[in-house]
């Protein structure tokens, strides 16, 4: 049988341990006489049989430590895990995700108010009371907010003719408010009357081309936490109501806008002020910000572009798409159904990836099926618990510096698990043959470190 | 591995002018001097009444390294009637694209607007200027009677440009026909001979142009990027164009016949919103004398080992085969949000091994997002997937990322040492950098043993 520990001629402890998780290094001074130093590297059982005492063998074990005290998480446990890894080794632990029965819900309506949406805007007037009544079954504390968007207010997306720059619809059949990138109209409030008033005041706007600046507005709504009023403890729902596709990051080169979106909040007096100087966010960037900010998106789409958004869903974890009927008649039911679907899906993703550390996560669903962690479980109820079997592997020790923790994040949840990674890449007894000195660390006395007095 | 990174020639332009947004070499036939051409689309000019008209600068590579603006157009806006301008040159982005071929320079302003003659509008038709030796003419093929969004009113002609071997220009206008986009090609000789400063809409007899299609093709952006190469074996350059929003944003690349603008071949991206077709290039990378196609998708997301999507960018390498079809491989970027594939520059045979090489930029990669350019070598099987050299941007961000590598041009030996050189633009810090290739020394070691 192949023994890579003994056959690889490892001349130092660190090199020996890097060969594989089964390798050990004997530090006993009298272990070899006249032989090669590499004989010190072997499988532990071989080292013992060759006369190395057990406490003289460098063989860092894999530890998974889950602190039991100070657990503050209620939905994602454990909230913290410490793992000691050595090259080639893997550690295992279970993560539990337990959805609550009723969440507080923050629902922010982000509405495309371009001219083609004229039919759907009217329906918003009757959203408030009906929706809050329906949501009372699923939420213990429901709040609504509202914002509008059109597109970047530059050529070629809007007409820059002086007579039309503030009313794209002059010369048309519509009365339109000035075009805008994104306006935050109403912060999240439990005052439904206030919401209905804000919606009732909303006028249609307009631009020239078909795609709109939805991703710009979504990113701002996600990251401008204090402006919107997103609560930490609430399920955060961003409802994007539109009938057209969205502009992509690099579309704005047509307008001479070539500075990548910085992903930060840029609202001044509730208006997105960097709309005309920064690109639309890319899908990857938008996805990252939505997940970071625990935002679940509901695309409520009227017309044939519904399928465009539906096809985007695999690229935007934690999003859902529903089709609005003519004049948005089914809008409230769509929201309720989407919310039920979103809270019944539990999937996780690894954030803050640590270089050289690999995660393999398998979801064990309430029905007993197993799925990849990113796919997760569907149809989870508040009585259910989803288990995630997490395997953490460190392939080799060639990474220096960088982050020493990763985060496992259930998508749309406001709790995470922090995984501290300790790399056992060096030996407690290094191979320096210098003059003996006192051992600094009292835990490794001369029984192990033969250099010590 | 043989680009000299220790002593590149650095050129800088006016701050905030986006100097370096477009770059090319300029090797006039009559002169022994050689130049760099650098677009600065937000530069202020001496044109009366014009704000940020944009300019193209000519930089002497050898001695002074000074850059002088080329005067293509010294005039302000022409008037249709009193207090009614015919055109709007402020913020027109002149210099957003620039290409040269021998004595010819074509430079464009894709955000040039005009009022139209029929009704008072303000439409971004785009315009270009062509300099051929001492003669400078305007070339605005989208400034036509076919106005409005459903015509050529929003064409933005000159958004992308190239020259063919046979002295045609190829121009991309991504906004024609409700942003279906359009390719237009005209003969240099006819552009020059037909020019009349008093005629706003010039008709060219030998023009090749794509036409409007059904509305389902709206918002595709044909003409966003262009390149040329022979793809049907007739010895005439065909037209390659990125169409990044086509196929419901999967993105496509179309190849049209350079003789008659008929469709030859299409490539389709595999992921929505990856911006497949943002950049295109054509060069024979595997030494079989067939031009190969390189397509950038800078927003492509790759699924990592943990299943998480990460935006790394991707370049598709499609090798043209004798049978006329293509064999495609994919090359993913190395860093998240670096936008690998934003620019692709054929380099010629950089290391003189008989195979052409290529540069691929990730303008937001590297330390502090300073930008990275990867050099990949060609070989008989295609592209070597491991970069042979990595050029790193050395300039810290000012008010925006440096964007080192956003524009690149290679395949020209400016220092006449037999090895082609590379220009890299970094418009965010108003720089253009010339990397010269050093000769490759091949050492042949031999051992002869003479038994006694």
């Amino acid at each position: 049988e192949d023994n890579r520990c003994a056959s690889s001629n490892a001349a130092s402890c660190a090199r020996c341990l890097a060969l594989g998780p089964e390798c050990g290094w004997c530090v006993q001074e009298d272990f070899i006489s006249g032989g090669s130093r590499s004989e010190r590297c072997d499988i532990v059982s071989n080292l013992i049989s060759k006369g190395c005492s057990v406490d003289s063998i460098e063989y860092p074990s894999v530890h998974v430590i889950i602190p039991t005290e100070n657990e503050i998480n209620t939905q994602v446990t454990p909230g913290e895990v410490s793992i000691q890894l050595r090259p080639g080794a893997e550690a295992n632990f279970m993560l539990k995700v337990h959805p609550l029965k009723k969440y507080p819900v923050d629902l922010y309506y982000l509405v495309d108010v371009s001219a083609s949406m004229h039919n759907n805007i009217e329906k918003l007037n009757s959203v408030g009371n009906d929706l809050s009544r329906k949501m009372a079954f699923f939420s213990r504390d429901f709040r609504l907010g509202f914002g509008s968007y059109v597109d970047k207010t530059v050529s070629p997306y809007i007409s820059i003719h002086p007579e039309r720059i503030h009313n794209q619809c002059s010369d048309y059949n519509l009365d339109c408010m000035p075009p805008h990138g994104y306006i935050h109209v109403l912060s999240l409030t439990e005052n439904i009357t206030e919401f209905e008033k804000a919606v009732h005041r909303q006028k249609i706007s307009g631009n020239i081309d078909t795609p709109e600046g939805g991703f710009d507005a979504m990113l701002q709504a996600a990251v401008c936490e204090s402006h919107i009023g997103w609560r930490k403890e609430a399920k955060r729902l961003l409802l994007v109501m539109t009938d057209q596709t969205s502009h992509l990051a690099l579309d704005s080169k047509l307008a001479g806008i070539v500075v990548p979106n910085d992903g930060n909040c840029h609202l001044k007096n509730n208006v997105y002020v960097k709309s005309t100087t920064m690109e639309h966010p890319s899908l990857g960037q938008l996805s990252e910000k939505l997940i970071d900010n625990n935002i679940n998106v509901i695309f409520a789409v009227q017309g044939k572009q519904f399928h465009w958004y539906k096809d985007l869903l695999p690229l935007l974890p934690g999003t859902i798409a529903g089709e609005i009927e003519s004049k948005a008649a089914n809008l409230n039911n769509l929201v309720v159904e989407a919310y039920q679907k979103l809270i019944s899906e539990v999937k996780v993703q690894v954030e803050n990836q640590v270089q050289g550390i690999y995660f393999n996560i398998t979801a064990i669903c309430p029905d007993g099926s197993r799925k990849p962690g990113m796919e997760g479980c569907r149809n989870v109820t508040s009585n259910d618990e989803v288990l995630f079997n997490v395997t953490v592997t460190m392939k080799k020790c060639d990474v220096t510096g960088g982050k020493n923790y990763a985060i496992i994040k259930p998508i749309g949840f406001n709790e995470t698990a922090k995984i501290h990674i300790h790399r056992n890449c060096s030996c407690q007894c290094e191979d320096n043959r210098g003059p003996k000195g006192k051992c600094v660390d009292e835990t490794f006395l001369d029984s192990k470190c033969f250099q010590c007095d | 591995f043989n680009l000299d990174v220790d002593s590149p020639a650095e050129y800088s332009g006016p701050e905030g002018s986006y100097f370096g947004f477009a770059v090319d070499f300029f090797v006039p036939s009559a002169s022994s001097r050689m130049f760099l051409l650098v677009g600065a689309p937000k530069a202020n000019t001496t044109q009366p009444g014009i704000v940020e008209g944009g300019q193209v600068l000519k930089c002497d590579w050898s001695s002074t390294r000074r850059c002088q603006p080329i005067e293509f157009d010294a005039t302000g806006n022409r008037d249709y009637a009193k207090d009614d301008p015919l055109e709007f040159k402020s913020h027109q982005w002149f210099g957003a694209s620039v290409r040269s071929k021998q004595d010819k320079i074509l430079a464009c302003a894709p955000l040039y607007h005009w009022r139209t003659e029929m009704k008072q509008e303000r439409e971004p038709v785009g315009t270009c200027f062509l300099q051929d030796g001492t003669k400078t003419v305007e070339y605005a093929p989208c400034r036509s009677q076919d106005i409005d969004a459903d015509g050529q009113g929003f064409c933005q002609g000159g958004f992308s440009i190239d020259f063919t071997k046979a002295d045609r220009v190829l121009l991309g206008g991504p906004g024609s026909f409700y942003w279906q986009g359009q390719l237009i090609s005209d003969q240099v000789a006819e552009i020059v001979s037909k020019y009349d400063p008093n005629v706003y809409s010039i008709k060219y007899n030998n023009q090749l142009a794509t036409r409007t299609a059904q509305a389902i093709f709206d918002d595709s952006y044909l003409g966003y990027s262009v390149a040329v190469g022979d793809f049907n074996g007739d010895g005439i350059d065909d037209f390659v164009s990125g169409v990044p929003r086509a196929a419901r944003t999967l993105g496509m690349v179309y190849i049209y016949d350079g003789k008659n603008m008929s469709s030859l071949y299409n490539f389709t991206g595999e992921q929505m919103a990856a911006y497949f077709g943002f950049s295109v290039a054509a060069t024979d990378i595997n030494g079989d004398d067939y031009a190969d196609v390189f397509i950038g998708a800078p927003l492509f997301m790759d699924r990592g080992s943990d299943g998480k999507l990460q935006e790394v960018g991707q370049v598709s390498v499609s090798l043209q085969r004798a049978s006329g079809d293509f064999q495609t491989t994919k090359l993913n970027g190395f860093e998240v949000f670096a936008r690998f594939g934003s620019a692709i520059a054929p380099l010629g045979d950089l290391d003189q091994d008989g195979f052409n090489d290529i540069a691929i930029a990730a303008p937001y990669g590297g330390e502090d997002k300073k930008g990275i350019v990867y050099i990949f070598n060609g070989r008989s099987t295609g592209l070597n997937a491991v970069p042979s050299q990595i050029l790193e941007g050395q300039w810290a961000a000012r008010s925006m990322p440096p964007s080192f590598g956003y524009s690149m041009k290679g395949a020209t030996d400016i220092d006449k040492n037999g090895y082609p050189d590379l220009i890299v633009g970094a418009f965010g810090v108003d720089r253009a950098i010339l990397y010269r290739a050093r000769p490759v020394i091949t050492v042949n070691a031999g051992l002869e043993v003479y038994p006694s």
Partner: antibody, heavy 127, light 107 residues
């Protein structure tokens, strides 16, 4: 069902005035631009005037500019055409029509297409 | 103003015939053209808009084509209820203008 009913037509002397009304029902009146189109006896159709949904923008044919005024009362779902300084050539059947909000290729709807028309009211200008 | 010219000004046809009416604009109007049908003593009825889009509720035997300056209305198989006057109208720019009409009569 969309209904448009014109009234106010009749015989008037040259130089006189008349006010036409159009009562609308079956749709959200304030969301639609409205037009007046006329047809002289035995002749073709001629567009006269139009008004946007809120009443903020008005448009007139050169032949009636300065003499006719279009207005609307959205609370009453009614469109008006005040006709002053009437001439013999203004004799026609006057139709009130709803401007359709039909999709175009871009964001803005099509202009000046009328999808519903009233039955018309006859205005005769004669001495 | 843009002038619209229809031809012929009248035509006679039988039930089942294929009928074609043309309309020419004095300048390019892209595809911004509508067709209306009017029966004696009645209000006009919208048939086609944007040159070729069929208004909902209009039978599919009606079709429109053309772009720029030349447009066509085709009735693929004339029915008894189709005998009427047909008007084209440009909806490209203000003021919208109509053609003089084409009367389709029973042969």
């Amino acid at each position: 069902e969309v209904q448009l009913v014109e009234s106010g037509g009749g015989l008037v002397q040259p130089g006189g005035s008349l006010r036409l009304s159009c009562a609308a029902s079956g749709f959200t009146f304030s969301s639609y631009a409205m037009s007046w189109v006329r047809q002289a006896p035995g002749k073709g159709l001629e567009w006269v005037s139009a008004i946007s949904g809120s009443g903020g923008s008005t448009y007139y044919a050169d032949s009636v500019k300065g003499r006719f005024t279009i207005s609307r009362d959205n609370s009453k779902n009614t469109l008006y055409l005040q006709m002053n300084s009437l001439r013999a050539e203004d004799t026609a059947v006057y139709y009130c029509a709803r401007s359709a909000l039909l999709p175009s290729r871009g964001d803005l709807p099509l202009r000046w297409v009328s999808d519903y028309w009233g039955q018309g009211t006859l205005v005769t200008v004669s001495s | 103003d843009i002038q619209m010219t229809q031809s012929p000004s009248s035509l006679s046809a039988s039930v089942g015939d294929r009928v074609t009416i043309t309309c020419r604009a004095s300048q390019g109007i892209s595809s911004y053209l509508a067709w209306y049908q009017q029966k004696p003593g009645k209000a006009p009825k919208l048939l086609i808009y944007a040159a070729s889009s069929l208004q909902s509720g209009v039978p599919s035997r009606f079709s429109g084509s053309g772009s720029g300056t030349d447009f066509t209305l085709t009735i693929s198989s004339l029915q008894p209820e189709d005998f009427a006057t047909y008007y084209c109208q440009q909806h490209y720019t203000t003021p919208p203008t109509f053609g003089q009409g084409t009367k389709v009569e029973i042969k």
